[in-house]
């Protein structure tokens, strides 16, 4: 596959990844109330998000709360929050300079300095990708730990909501995506040393006989 | 395992008061912990408990937005910050080890009095 | 919330009576995960602080004698004393230890 077209792939592939992160940021369902007995009637359902929490009634009544307070809220939504945000904003930035180093833009002259930027925008992606990883594995670890911990109470139990695993495809997206546009950036290059520009050497003239050197031919 | 009240006494409406509990015999943050109240009236009240490292509380309603529990891993201490105080909350006021939401441990008790 | 309801509140009883305490929940809290009772019992001897007995319904807490015996399952529990002594005397509860609010029942008290 050409160079060009993993850059466009790649480059797909991380704002799709990019809008799923964004998704799952506001998505009020990081964690959801589980269901562990039928016989305690449960006439509602609670979601658990970054920004607000969300009461299901069984009706299919639905009433959101953003959280009031910052320092009220727990460590986990605070680090997820701080994290899932600076992975949002750093995608934002590896837009630009991916679009600056991508082969159908001028904005950089073409190059090895050119191809250099389209790398850093393919590591800035895969370094935003385990960003986001970060607090979504931690959020996750500590619902499944609670969930399993006799000493929780019972309605304060919770599975693993539809944001986690959409943040999860966006992940596996920013990272993929990145790791096409660090590949794009490689073969435009021709070379694996991207640190100095390539040296082109003058062309042999022909031998006496009117024939090219032997050694010009592999 | 021993587990030792302080701070309880005659308090008046809408005033606030603190309780302390020092733990000891076992390792603290290893362990939920929680304050069980008795009154001739209600007989054994559960009013709250805290998780491990303190980051979860529950409460029991009638005391919810007006006692806040907490802790001191590092001092193995466990405290109960009481506001708004009202009559119905004169009780004794017992500080339990609380694992697998049960209450195996308890302290000698303090008294709490709420009246003007 | 969970009422548990004791009955009954006042018991006089003789040393080596068998005696039975009932316990009866507003609603079932059998774990259908693990099939568990989650139900506790526990004694208040006078001046003291309630102490831990019976846990899941009939496990007994170590320390505490045999003659200690927890019973039932879904919404109707018992706590058996097989043979009464003087010590025994003091007011037992039971507590659902499933879900918040934690809720005790009113209390049996065992008197010679």
């Known amino acids: 596959m050409g160079s060009a077209a993993l850059e466009i792939l790649g480059l797909v592939l991380c704002l799709v990844g990019w809008g799923g992160l964004i998704l799952a940021c506001g998505l009020p369902m990081w964690q959801v109330t589980a269901f562990l007995d039928h016989n305690i009637v449960t006439a509602q359902t609670t979601w658990k998000g970054l920004w607000m929490s969300c009461v299901v009634q069984s009706t299919g009544h639905m009433q959101c709360k953003v959280y009031d307070s910052v320092l009220a809220l727990s460590t986990e939504v605070q680090a997820a929050r701080a994290l899932t945000v600076s992975a949002v904003l750093l995608a934002f930035v590896a837009l630009f300079v991916t679009l600056a180093g991508a082969q159908c833009t001028t904005c950089v002259a073409p190059g090895p300095a050119k191809a250099r930027v389209a790398l850093t925008g393919g590591v800035l992606y895969l370094f935003c990708g385990l960003l986001a990883l970060v607090p979504l594995c931690w959020f996750a670890n500590i619902v499944v730990r609670e969930f399993y911990d006799p000493s929780v109470p019972v309605s304060q139990k919770y599975e693993l909501g539809a944001a986690l695993y959409i943040g999860w495809a966006a992940t596996a997206l920013l990272m993929v995506g990145g790791c096409l546009l660090c590949c794009g950036a490689w073969v435009c290059t021709g070379r694996p040393d991207l640190s100095f520009p390539v040296k082109y050497s003058a062309p042999r003239r022909p031998t006496a006989t009117g024939d090219y050197d032997k050694k010009n031919y592999v | 395992v021993k587990v030792v009240e302080s701070g309880g006494g005659l308090v008046q409406p809408g005033r606030s008061m603190k309780l302390s509990c020092a733990a000891s015999?076992?390792?603290?943050?290893?362990?939920?912990m929680a304050w069980v109240r008795q009154s001739p009236k209600k007989g054994l009240e559960w009013v709250a408990s805290i998780n491990y490292g303190g980051s979860r509380t529950y409460y029991e309603d009638s005391v919810k937005g007006r006692f806040t529990i907490s802790r001191d891993n590092a001092k193995s201490t466990l405290y109960l910050q009481m506001n708004s105080l009202r009559s119905e909350d004169t009780a004794t006021y017992y500080c339990?080890?609380?694992?697998?939401?049960?209450?195996?441990?308890w302290g000698q008790g303090v008294m709490v009095t709420v009246s003007s | 919330d969970i009422v548990m309801t004791q009955s009954p509140s006042f018991l006089a009883v003789s040393v080596g009576e068998t005696v039975t305490i009932n316990c009866k929940s507003s609603?079932?809290?059998?774990?259908?995960?693990?099939?568990?009772?989650?139900l506790a019992w526990y004694q208040q001897k006078p001046g003291q602080s309630p102490k831990l007995l019976i846990h899941?319904?009939?496990t007994r807490e170590s320390g505490v004698p045999d003659r200690f015996i927890g019973s039932g399952s879904g919404t109707d529990f018992t706590l058996t004393i097989s043979s009464m002594q003087a010590e025994d005397v003091a007011i037992y509860y039971c507590q659902q230890h499933y879900d918040i609010p934690y809720t005790f029942g009113a209390g049996t008290k065992l008197e010679l």
């Open positions: 899941l319904a009939s």
């Open positions: 015999g076992f390792t603290f943050s290893d362990y939920f």
């Open positions: 339990a080890r609380h694992p697998h939401r049960l209450f195996d441990y």
């Open positions: 609603q079932s809290f059998l774990s259908s995960g693990n099939q568990e009772n989650y």
